[in-house]
């Protein structure tokens, strides 16, 4: 697995740098991760026919994986910092039962998957500090999470290789899309 | 990491239009955020519109907002820059720069490749 930000060797030679600011870390964060699904897209595609299979929609109705829409706050039309910041938090909430799904679906990059699943948890804290509006932030129920998770498990091969993919798709492009927004701020 | 070439610079009257072009060479081209950046003479780089991989996500500068459009063709590895009621304080050298990570954003550091650029001048 890829070393977490702020442990890279290129860090230790250099201990006269200044810390980063919260923003900076955030930015690291997101970037690691998305490193991190790169990896985990690679093995995704190498082992089966998904990236390229057109249909996506079969599986995609068995989910309901967060999605930037306009109303979010996140984009440049209508943009508002606590409205997305919130937004983001949520969604990252939402996709943690699908991270959890992810466990266990690799071979080869299993340690990348639980990394991407720690890494998403540290972001989580990072966020949360910076919002000013916590009240704001709904929590998944844990019960319709373990339901969901069960659902999930019980597909047949072919549908638990598409929703990997399109787990891995859709946190790629919400990650994405928040960074950008977060650049902004 | 991407090749980037830009084209369609040139000598424009103001309030004319102009259409600039970066061609990028990669087979990657469709997962990049791609940006515009620009520099006038004795002035700092500064970002001017920005695209995400579907082109779904799309940011200007307030100075462009309005008069230019950013656009791609994910199948001919082309970003575009519609500029339109050109003004002369829009002459500058055009940079058009790449992020791998998807992401774009209005600072140079942001991005991993660029463009040589090409010059826009707009005469009063």
């Known amino acids: 697995a890829p070393v977490p930000p702020g442990e890279d060797s290129k860090d230790v030679a250099a201990p006269h740098r200044q810390p980063l600011t919260s923003s900076e870390r955030i930015d690291k964060q997101i970037r690691y991760i998305l490193d991190g699904i790169s990896a985990l897209r690679k093995e995704t595609c190498n082992k089966s026919n998904m990236c390229e299979s057109s249909k996506e929609a079969l599986a995609e109705n068995n989910l309901n994986l967060p999605k930037m829409a306009e109303k979010d706050g996140c984009f440049q039309s209508g943009f508002n910092e606590e409205t997305c910041l919130v937004k983001i938090i949520t969604g990252l909430l939402e996709f943690e039962v699908y991270l959890e799904y992810l466990q266990n679906r690799f071979e080869s990059s299993e340690e990348q998957a639980r990394a991407v699943q720690m890494s998403t948890k540290v972001l989580i804290q990072f966020l949360q500090k910076k919002a000013k509006n916590l009240d704001a932030i709904t929590t998944p129920d844990p019960t319709t999470n373990a339901s969901l998770l069960t659902k999930l498990q019980a597909q047949n091969q072919w549908l638990q290789d598409m929703t990997t993919h399109l787990i891995l798709r859709s946190f790629k492009e919400f990650l994405q899309s928040s960074l950008r927004a977060l650049r902004q701020m | 990491e991407v090749q980037l070439v830009e084209s369609g610079g040139g000598l424009v009257q103001a309030g004319g239009p102009l259409r600039l072009s970066c061609t990028v060479s990669?087979?990657?081209?469709?997962?990049?955020?791609m940006g515009w950046f620009r520099q006038a003479p004795g002035k700092e780089r500064e970002f001017v519109a920005d695209?995400?991989?579907?082109?779904?996500?799309?940011w200007y500068a307030d100075s462009v907002k309005g008069r230019f459009t950013i656009s791609r063709d994910n199948a001919k590895n082309v970003m575009y820059l519609q500029m339109n009621s050109l003004k002369p304080e829009d002459t500058a050298v055009y940079y058009c720069?790449?992020?791998?990570?998807?992401?774009?954003?209005?600072?140079?550091?942001?991005?991993?490749?660029w463009g040589q650029g090409t010059q826009v001048t707009v005469s009063s």
């Open positions: 990669g087979r990657t081209f469709s997962t990049y955020a």
């Open positions: 695209i995400n991989w579907n082109s779904d996500n799309i």
């Open positions: 720069a790449a992020d791998s990570y998807g992401v774009g954003g209005g600072k140079e550091e942001y991005y991993d490749s």
